[in-house]
């Protein structure tokens, strides 16, 4: 008879977890020379240690503490790229722009990114079934405690002019409730942060409005001004020639508004 | 609410052996590394030693390096210090800490104890 | 003798503003982060600033850090009488075996 399993409102934990985890650790350790000493073995441990055995709607920061530890990597403060909605643009922006760089583009995010896992009280199992839906079930399960975590810790970790990608094509350019405007803007340390700068992505073609009036911009200036922050905020009209900008920018297309 | 508790202090000849507590509650103690601290009377902090969350790895300042040993017990929520061959320039406060790791920066020291006093005298 | 320097005493008036600094060298603050601890008269130390300019929840925004190449400074305005204390600056030394590195601490009297 099989054992009673909780079922949950999200989906299971990736397959192919463990493996997944530990060759994305070998690959990036191999491909950042400044994180080769990193023991990926260890690391899979600690990842493993923050939600095997645990309820999985009763994860905390702490647990993260020694994956935290094992995957410290300091980035240089003033080339951080922030991202909501939009995280394929941003991504392949700093695949172009090589200097700057997202959380995805640390050995944390990394490991993590698009993935999902949690476990089951006092067992040593992996729930493959299901994992607790954020809205459905609760906020504090493996998956957004991790999120929630290391993306306060990067915006806390940013200085100078902080970028951030926000997409025009929603109705909520900038959304309270997203990681971003919920734990990003509010970790941004206002002694280190001197500008916050949006860079409002475009979605349709013939698409010429001022987007950086938009309400919910206005709003985010106004969040970002009262935490002694400047705020800046430019359209992208054009997120191909962006790119494409970005990887010549000596092309003579290059310097018209994109 | 997260504390630290140290114990074991008190004066010891030159030469002799003492070992410090420092109990922990209010916080998930296997999860954290852990650290010693000392001062001497009227002088500044000194760390002396650290040990990883699972026990694997330590580190000490070359002033104890192989005199003193950390170490802990997670199922106790407990860490020592095991200090051997002390003199009069171990006399000192010792302090034990939690070490906090940020992910995109360097860690800290986030909660101490109050500190046990130590003291090495004939 | 510290590997990080620090002025032995400082002093202000209340509601005026006081810097304290921290220097350092290339192995340890200019390629790590500094924490700033507070000890208070007969009391343990405290943290007060982690990651070079970040408050811990609690610690009020009139104390705030900064780092410059290879200095660290930590700032209080609005000073009062209750910041008299002892305050460490502390990072990571990267040519030493047993890297984490103090300050040898800065009084603060409040005049």
């Known amino acids: 008879v099989p054992r009673w399993r909780q079922q949950w409102s999200g989906p299971g934990t990736t397959k192919r977890f463990p493996e997944t985890v530990l060759a994305r650790c070998v690959k990036y350790t191999e491909i950042h020379p400044e994180m080769r000493h990193v023991d990926c073995q260890s690391v899979w441990d600690a990842f493993k240690g923050a939600f095997i055995s645990k309820h999985p709607c009763n994860i905390t920061e702490e647990d993260y503490q020694p994956l935290m530890k094992l995957g410290t990597q300091t980035v240089p403060c003033n080339k951080i790229l922030l991202w909501s909605r939009i995280k394929d643009l941003a991504h392949q922006f700093t695949q172009v722009q090589r200097d700057m760089f997202t959380l995805e583009d640390t050995l944390l995010g990394y490991l993590a990114d698009d993935l999902t896992w949690c476990g089951e009280f006092n067992t040593s199992k992996i729930n493959y079934q299901s994992c607790p839906d954020w809205r459905k079930d609760c906020s504090n399960n493996p998956v957004s405690v991790f999120w929630k975590t290391v993306s306060r810790r990067f915006a806390e970790a940013a200085c100078d002019v902080v970028h951030v990608m926000l997409n025009g094509s929603r109705s909520k350019i900038f959304d309270k409730n997203s990681t971003f405007g919920s734990v990003e803007v509010h970790n941004l340390q206002p002694e280190k942060v001197q500008t916050l700068e949006a860079w409002v992505i475009h979605g349709g073609r013939e698409d010429s409005r001022d987007l950086c009036q938009d309400p919910t911009i206005k709003e985010l200036e106004s969040i970002i001004s009262k935490r002694n922050i400047q705020f800046s905020c430019k359209n992208i009209y054009r997120p191909d020639k962006f790119l494409q900008c970005v990887k010549n920018p000596e092309d003579s297309s290059c310097t018209s508004e994109i | 609410e997260v504390q630290l508790l140290e114990s074991g202090g008190g004066l010891v000849q030159p030469g002799g052996s003492l070992r410090l507590s420092c109990a922990a509650s209010g916080f998930t103690f296997n999860n954290y590394d852990m650290t010693w601290v000392r001062q001497a009377p009227g002088k500044g902090l000194e760390w002396v030693a650290v040990?990883?969350?699972?026990?694997?790895?330590?580190d000490y300042a070359d002033s104890v390096k192989g005199r003193f040993t950390i170490s802990r017990d997670n199922s106790k929520n407990t860490l020592y210090l095991q200090m051997n061959s002390l003199r009069a320039e171990d006399t000192a406060v010792y302090y034990c800490a939690r070490v906090y790791y940020y992910g995109f920066s360097g860690p800290s020291m986030d909660v101490w104890g109050q500190g046990t006093l130590v003291t090495v005298s004939s | 003798q510290s590997v990080l320097t620090q002025p032995p005493s400082a002093s202000g008036t209340p509601g005026q503003r006081v810097t304290i600094s921290c220097s350092g060298s290339?192995?340890?603050?200019?390629?790590?982060?500094v924490n700033w601890y507070q000890q208070l008269p007969g009391t343990a130390p405290k943290l007060l600033i982690y990651?070079?300019?970040n408050r811990p929840s609690g610690v009020p925004d009139r104390f705030s850090g900064s780092k410059s190449g290879t200095s660290a400074s930590l700032a209080i305005s609005g000073l009062r009488s209750e910041d008299e204390a002892d305050y460490y600056c502390?990072?990571?030394?990267?040519?030493?075996?047993?890297?984490?590195?103090f300050g040898g601490g800065t009084k603060l009297t409040v005049l």
């Open positions: 990651s070079d300019s």
């Open positions: 290339n192995s340890n603050i200019g390629s790590n982060t």
């Open positions: 502390q990072s990571y030394d990267s040519s030493l075996s047993g890297s984490r590195v």
């Open positions: 040990i990883s969350y699972d026990g694997s790895d330590k």
